[in-house]
């Protein structure tokens, strides 16, 4: 499919000008060759009207230029003088015409309207409101006023003053007759139709002696406004339509087939679900403006989206509309991330943010989207060391792997963590990538003790039990701070005896933490990785409390939850040792399914080409 | 104690550049994001500008863009707004705050989402543009 979007229709009328504006990715190469606007011919072929080289057709000569903005990715055709001649089809493109990196382009241009002499005419948007004005003499003060559309050769009654509107109005006009000082009646016609366009006449009094007077309502159906963006990337729609209808909901929807409009989202409170997790509808403004985020951008995103108000929200003929057409560009220099990562109660996730890599240091951020709330986003954690208070000790941000992705490592899951979470930068490329954490049935794979306590001045080893699922991978134990978690030394002890059906390829690992001191309180993860790709994490909290008098000595875990054993050694050296065989109660069977991608894997995997990217979780 | 002292303002023309300060104690200065709100006689606050913990992150109201600058030392726990091309709407009296919880709106933009003025806050340096 071709990179290159623009206008799929222009109309135009005889005499007047038309602006074209055609994208194009903005790749050095594309910057830089050849732009041009061609008429495709009966036969194919497409004849060069005006390029960026500097040709322009005898036909164009002194009314048409090209214009090229390399830096927004656009060139845009202005032609001028136009006549029926100009209508037909075209071709804007960039390189050789006939290489099909080209956009077509249908140009409509009609006869100006055949307007009585002293016609009025009123231009008005589709949605919107029209006051006809209709002066009148002070003999025909008294008399009955009316407001007729000409229908064919017809001229039909629209309103007049004795009460009648035609059905075809009925709730949506009103005929105003001014003080006695003015001479004037006015027609206000509100949520205006395509179908109300027409010529009208006004008339005060019935005989030979009325007032009489012409006017042409020509209702605009909005033009689209062009939007090019990024697969994966995200569209902001500005939707502002007028302070009139600032208390009425609104919508934003996505034209189908025909004239259906199915709604995406509305102030209603509905959703599609296509768009659940990847949308917001920013609260109004008093004016009655609002904007809508859509991210994570797929192909089928694209096409054309109406914002509008009604009672409803949703389209209804008169409602008063923006529009916009969706170019969705799938040479996207935004790298595929997982839109779904699962993780099981008390496991973890690790969750790989793109950004954009020319801004490398920029600060990363990453917050809980809260869809009821109108779409705020809190923080929970950023690239500069803060850290949301109640996620101290489970959630950290690393700038790993780099070159345009970054990685965030949420454990301890409870089922209120499932949600959509934003991956954000501050720098100048907007990318707001998407993420939905799903809380799925299972175990989590690494089995440390819980909460531990160490005792000042002596020696404390902390298990992590591997299952051989992660053989292959490199195994840690580090200190969680508010920048990250400091790798600590660790020694691999051997095959773990912690699984019930697994190889000599499971391992505990521990960390041993000699001569404890006060600065050793604080949280420790245990986790897998290869490379620069984190998976699964287990987190340990230590505390650390004085000797106990010689004697008295505690040497019950203290508060340890998976209630492993503790042996004091005579040296002054503490073990924690899970008795996992001996109570199998303990640790859930390790159930390996075969078509579960782990955590680690699915961290570094690369995903699928579906809408729904996922990233696999624990065992389920 | 928490505590947040404000100084720097004063009278200036239109045009003109102050330079607000806001010395922070008795609280970990360099693990808050910070930022300026203001109040116009008569008028509720308004949010100015925040910054980040490491100062990296700069937001700040359109009425201000490209002319107030936000920055801290954390040194110093010292918080500034540096106020040039003043105008006589930049009239109020300007409040330093730390934000429990920094949020983001719906097109990647600091959010202020409000605060109590008992929650920490100073007594507010006033700031008059005249002529």
């Known amino acids: 499919k071709s990179p290159i979007f623009g206008p799929e229709e222009v109309n135009s009328v005889e005499g007047n000008s038309v602006s074209i504006t055609c994208y194009y990715p903005p790749t050095s190469v594309n910057r830089h060759t050849r732009k041009y606007w061609c008429r495709q011919g009966a036969r194919g072929g497409c004849i060069t009207l005006i390029s960026s080289e500097g040709y322009v057709s005898s036909k164009y000569a002194g009314r048409a230029n090209l214009t090229n903005f390399p830096e927004n990715g656009t060139f845009v055709v202005n032609i001028a003088q136009l006549s029926q001649d100009d209508s037909g089809r075209y071709k804007c493109g960039l390189g050789i015409n006939s290489r099909g990196l080209s956009f077509d382009v249908s140009l409509e241009v009609s006869q100006g309207p055949g307007l009585l002499n002293d016609t009025k005419v009123y231009t008005v948007d589709l949605g919107r409101t029209v006051t006809i004005n209709c002066p009148f003499k002070t003999e025909n003060a008294q008399k009955r006023k009316s407001l007729y559309k000409q229908i064919g050769l017809y001229p039909v009654l629209v309103i007049d003053s004795s009460g009648y509107v035609n059905p075809n109005y009925t709730g949506r006009i009103r005929l105003d007759i001014q003080g006695t000082g003015q001479l004037l009646f006015s027609v206000v016609i509100n949520q205006l139709r395509l179908s109300d366009a027409g010529q009208y006449l006004c008339q005060a009094g019935d005989d030979s002696n009325s007032n009489k007077k012409n006017a042409d309502l020509q209702v605009l159906k909005p033009e689209p406004e062009l939007v090019y963006e990024d697969l994966r990337g995200s569209v902001t729609f500005h939707c502002a339509l007028g302070p009139e209808v600032a208390n009425v909901a609104k919508f934003l929807c996505r034209q189908s087939s025909g004239e259906n409009c199915d709604v995406v989202v509305n102030t209603l409170g509905k959703r599609a679900p296509a768009f659940e997790g990847r949308i917001l509808l920013n609260p109004q403004d008093k004016d009655g403006s609002f904007s809508v985020v859509i991210t994570g951008l797929r192909k089928e995103d694209a096409g054309r989206y109406l914002c509008g108000a009604h009672s409803d929200g949703q389209l209804q003929e008169g409602s008063p509309i923006q529009a916009w057409q969706l170019f969705v560009n799938e040479e996207s220099t935004i790298p595929r991330s997982p839109t779904v990562v699962k993780g099981v109660a008390g496991g973890s996730v690790a969750v790989l943010c793109p950004y954009n890599r020319k801004e490398s240091k920029s600060i990363k951020y990453w917050c809980l989207w809260e869809g009821a709330q109108n779409g705020r986003c809190p923080l929970l954690v950023d690239s500069e060391g803060w850290v949301k208070a109640q996620y101290e000790g489970r959630l950290s941000l690393l700038e790993e792997p780099g070159n345009g992705t970054f990685t965030v490592i949420l454990n301890q899951l409870t089922s209120r963590d499932a949600g959509f979470y934003w991956c954000l930068t501050n720098g100048d490329t907007l990318w707001r990538t998407t993420v939905e954490i799903k809380i799925i049935e299972g175990e989590p794979n690494l089995k440390v003790p819980g909460n531990v306590t160490a005792v000042l001045g002596e020696t404390l080893k902390v298990p992590c039990h591997f299952p051989c699922k992660f053989s292959s991978y490199e195994k840690y134990w580090c200190k969680w701070n508010n920048t990250g978690c400091q790798a600590l030394p660790s020694q691999d002890e051997g095959p773990s005896k912690a699984f019930v059906n697994c190889d000599e390829n499971s391992r505990l690992v521990s960390l041993t933490l000699n001569l404890v001191t006060r600065a050793d309180e604080g949280w420790y993860w245990c986790g897998v990785k290869q490379g620069h790709f984190y998976g699964e994490t287990a987190a340990v909290y230590v505390a650390v409390e004085e000797r106990k008098a010689a004697g008295s000595r505690d040497v019950s875990l203290a508060k340890a939850d998976a209630a492993p054993d503790e042996k004091v050694l005579d040296s002054g050296f503490r073990e924690i040792e899970n008795k996992a065989i001996q109570d199998p109660r303990l640790f859930a069977e390790e159930k390996a399914v075969a078509d579960t991608r782990d955590q680690a894997d699915g961290s570094r995997a690369s995903v699928d080409s579906g809408s729904s990217e996922e990233q696999g979780g624990s065992s389920r | 104690e928490v505590q947040l002292v404000e100084s720097g303002g004063g009278l200036a023309q239109p045009g003109g550049s102050l330079r607000l300060s806001c010395a922070a104690s008795g609280f970990a200065f360099s693990s808050y994001w910070m930022y300026w709100v203001r109040q116009a006689p008569g008028k509720g606050l308004e949010w100015v500008s925040a910054?980040?913990?490491?100062?990296?992150?700069?937001y700040y109201a359109d009425s201000v863009k490209g002319r107030f600058t936000i920055s801290r030392d954390n040194a110093k726990n010292t918080l500034y707004l540096q106020m040039n091309s003043l105008k006589p709407e930049d009239t109020a009296r300007y409040y330093c705050?730390?934000?429990?919880?920094?949020?983001?709106?719906?097109?990647?933009?600091?959010?202020?989402?409000?605060?109590?003025?008992?929650?920490?806050w100073g007594q507010g340096t006033q700031v008059t543009v005249s002529s």
């Open positions: 910054i980040s913990t490491g100062g990296g992150g700069t």
């Open positions: 705050a730390r934000d429990e919880a920094p949020t983001f709106d719906y097109s990647g933009n600091y959010a202020y989402t409000g605060s109590d003025p008992n929650d920490y």
